[in-house]
């Protein structure tokens, strides 16, 4: 039975040209995290394997920095970066947990962060 929950940064906004940290946290389970995938719609951004470290997709390698922790830092933001991002936690023995973050990249200098929320 999967008992864990993923806490994410929820809906966030950031300025064009700036950077943002995408962060998820898995709680309420003793399952071992073997890998975390960061994906945007149909695209793979990065993978963090607990043993082998980071794999960064070439299309993002100049704009993505691993971390902090299992999170991902997205840099040099453009309005095209607006959209849904998913953290996919591969765990043993529970299986897969998925968290969702919606990022809005704003032209203006007003970029407010949304509240944190949980996905069971």
């Amino acid at each position: 039975m999967m008992t864990g929950t993923i806490e994410t940064t929820g809906n966030i906004s950031a300025e064009k040209g700036g950077s943002i940290i995408l962060q998820c946290h898995l709680s309420s389970t003793t399952a071992q995290v073997t890998q975390v995938n960061w994906e945007q719609q149909d695209q793979l951004l990065a993978i963090c394997n607990a043993d082998l470290g980071w794999h960064i997709s070439p299309s993002f390698k100049d704009r993505v920095a691993p971390g902090p922790g299992l999170g991902l830092t997205l840099q040099s933001l453009t309005v095209n970066d607006t959209g849904e991002y998913f953290c996919i936690y591969h765990t043993y023995p529970d299986g897969t947990y998925t968290g969702r973050i919606f990022l809005e990249v704003l032209e203006s200098s007003v970029a407010e962060h949304g509240a944190r929320f949980q996905i069971p």
């Epitope: 073997t34 994906e39 793979l44 993978i47 043993d51 082998l52």
Partner: antibody
Framework: EVQLVQSGAEVKKPGASVKISCKVS????????MHWVRQAPGKGLEWIGG????????SYNQKFKGRATLTVDTSTSTAYMELSSLRSEDTAVYYC????????????WGQGTLVTVSS | DIQLTQSPSSLSASVGDRVTITCKAS??????VAWYQQKPGKAPKLLIY???YRNTGVPSRFSGSGSGTDFTLTISSLQPEDFATYYC?????????FGQGTKLEIK
């Protein structure tokens, strides 16, 4: 120039162990993952596992867990793969292969080491 | 484990031909697929990584495409040195797995 040089061919009896070395040069050893892959005669490629030398993180293919042991000696920039309890179906060419920078695919390969298991 | 199925298993073609090899994954692997070329008695050589990126030094006649579960390696105009066995590999999740290989032979 990046080079991965493996130890020579081995002939072993069933039940024995074999330890293959892979000495690298031309890059900073600790910055890249090392994978081990094998290929039985006339067959395809099979991933044994990978090791990250900087922190000792190791990922094994469950098929080999308990029989394969991956280690490194950072002082000599050498990776090792030991396989125990050998059986005839372990007869294969064993390759070490460097994981590309911040990627999991393998961009440089050793020349291969033939291990023959026969009574 | 993620299974990769290549087709065809073997293929006869002539110099100058356009050749396509496909690789189908048993589940979505996004673009985490590499292609290798192997000649008899030699180690594999990385051709394509992340589905569509040519490795350094690989001729432009080699191209890769695909995402999700379906991937393709295309050789636009076969050269004599291209006759070899080709393998796809997924690195979306461990254990990393390979297709069974496609042997490209001279017609």
């Amino acid at each position: 120039e990046v080079q991965l040089v493996q130890s020579g061919a081995e002939v072993k009896k069933p039940g024995a162990s074999v330890k293959i070395s892979c000495k690298v040069s031309g890059y900073t050893f600790t910055e890249f993952t090392m994978h081990w892959v094998r290929q039985a005669p006339g067959k395809g490629l099979e991933w044994i596992g990978g090791l990250k030398p900087d922190n000792g993180g190791i990922s094994y293919n469950q098929k080999f867990k308990g029989r394969a042991t991956l280690t490194v000696d950072t002082s000599t920039s050498t990776a090792y793969m030991e396989l125990s309890s050998l059986r005839s179906e372990d007869t294969a060419v064993y390759y070490c292969a460097r994981g590309a920078y911040y990627r999991y695919d393998a961009d440089y390969w050793g020349q291969g080491t033939l291990v023959t298991v026969s009574s | 484990d993620i299974q990769l199925t290549q087709s065809p298993s073997s293929l006869s073609a002539s110099v100058g031909d356009r050749v396509t090899i496909t690789c189908k994954a048993s589940q979505d692997v996004k673009t985490a697929v590499a292609w290798y070329q192997q000649k008899p008695g030699k180690a594999p050589k990385l051709l394509i990584y992340s589905a569509s990126y040519r490795n350094t030094g690989v001729p432009s006649r080699f191209s890769g495409s695909g995402s999700g579960t379906d991937f393709t390696l295309t050789i636009s105009s076969l050269q004599p040195e291209d006759f070899a066995t080709y393998y796809c590999q997924q690195h979306y999740s461990t254990p990393f797995t390979f297709g069974q290989g496609t042997k490209l032979e001279i017609k």
